[in-house]
Amino acid sequence: MAVTACQGLGFVVSLIGIAGIIAATCMDQWSTQDLYNNPVTAVFNYQGLWRSCVRESSGFTECRGYFTLLGLPAMLQAVRALMIVGIVLGAIGLLVSIFALKCIRIGSMEDSAKANMTLTSGIMFIVSGLCAIAGVSVFANMLVTNFWMSTANMYTGMGGMVQTVQTRYTFGAALFVGWVAGGLTLIGGVMMCIACRGLAPEETNYKAVSYHASGHSVAYKPGGFKASTGFGSNTKNKKIYDGGARTEDEVQSYPSKHDYV
């Protein structure tokens, strides 16, 4: 039960996180015009990964896309790449984790397969979250560097008395959305990895061997296994001891071609 809850919660947290990463990537407010200690402008500038916008005092907002690829700063390209990689990995992770959920039954998928898929999706979520956090942090670092550079030359002289005011940019809402979303995806991934440990069937130190007497159809199991009759189709071997509370369905093991000699 705890494993299912952990897995389900991990999935939900990751889903919210990835939705947040997608939202942050699409948002225009990665950097916003710094209004503190600046001349009061009748326009408000803000920029995203894909376009820059200007909101005029009348409320009219105009956005222009970055139609060049080669002309953009390498750092911006890197941030774009990190965010896209994060989204792609997260999306694949979500797809994998849907099939890995305990509450969803797909044919006769073994617990070991579900455990592997849970671990895979968990790792994908962790990497996705790290990509988003890294992307947002790189952009934030770029902003901080540019902020202090523009503060140093707040007013650049242009021939005598004429001055041009440099627009300073500060952290936009998308950065905080990205950080939180990346963190959630990371936490969700960790939860999936924890759930994977609980899903994986525990191996015993020795293989269970069945002996068939010529006259009776009785299987003898050494160690922690109860002997069961082999009549009918009931060939399941029930484990008596498992070190942890599990339902009967969770602990069933199906006979393989090596079980009987």
Partner: antibody
């Protein structure tokens, strides 16, 4: 047709108060920011104040801050300018003007103005 | 505050001739965010309120004749009346639309020679 009609001007003694009104019609008043601009007789234009469509933010020219207060009533399609502690140098024609949409913050429609004379 | 300096103070031009008015701002009116200039030109005829002619330094307001041409960028702007007509006799003002307080130039009076 967009129309802006100012009223409330007149002769007032120094130190007195006056409240100017601007009645707007022909457009959705609540969607537009509004300005007050004044012009002293025979002189140039001087911007006084701006109030956004939702009454915030509001901007004033520094020298009039504290004495002049701009407000609006979107339900009545009206703009107001409360002028206190009036001085002789406040004598001017006061215009209300609309902050145009998609015209780079320019003032696209102006009223005919109302004359305020501050004299003893 | 941004200081807007207009020149000349007055201008006498023959009908059909070109009239040129200059406007200089103390700070650049070019907004880096959209690379647009926030400068407007107004025409004021005697006894009338100002009328918007040009916004964004070069875009004509609807209904304004195409003989009115706005140009310039940053700190230096020009209003050109390519062929002066009798109805163009007025005072012309430039205005900073980027920084509060929004400031106007002193005005240029255009007359017929």
């Amino acid at each position: 047709e967009v129309q802006l009609v100012e009223s409330g001007g007149g002769l007032v003694q120094p130190g007195g108060s006056l409240r100017l009104s601007c009645a707007a019609s022909g457009f959705t008043f609540s969607s537009f920011g509004m300005h007050w601009v004044r012009q002293a007789p025979g002189k140039g234009l001087e911007w006084v104040a701006y109030i956004s469509s939702g009454s915030s933010p509001i901007y004033y020219v520094d020298k009039l801050k504290g004495r002049f207060t701009v407000s609006r009533d979107n339900a009545k399609n009206s703009l107001y300018l409360q002028m206190n502690s009036l001085r002789a140098e406040d004598t001017a024609v006061y215009y209300c003007a609309r902050a145009g949409y998609a015209v780079r913050n320019a003032l696209d429609y102006w009223g005919q103005g109302t004359l305020v004379t501050v004299s003893s | 505050d941004i200081v807007m300096t207009q020149s000349p103070d007055s201008l006498a031009v023959s009908l059909g001739e070109r009239a040129t008015i200059n406007c200089k701002s103390s700070q650049s009116l070019l907004n880096v965010g959209n690379q647009k200039n926030y400068l407007a030109w107004y025409q004021q005829k005697p006894g009338q309120p100002p009328k918007l002619l040009i916004y964004g330094a070069s875009t004509r307001e609807s209904g304004v004749p195409d003989r009115f041409i706005g140009s310039g960028s940053g700190t230096d702007f020009t209003l050109t009346i390519s062929s002066l007509q009798a109805e163009d006799v007025a005072v012309y003002f430039c205005q900073n639309d980027l920084f509060y307080p929004l400031t106007f130039g002193g005005g240029t009076k255009v007359e017929i020679k």
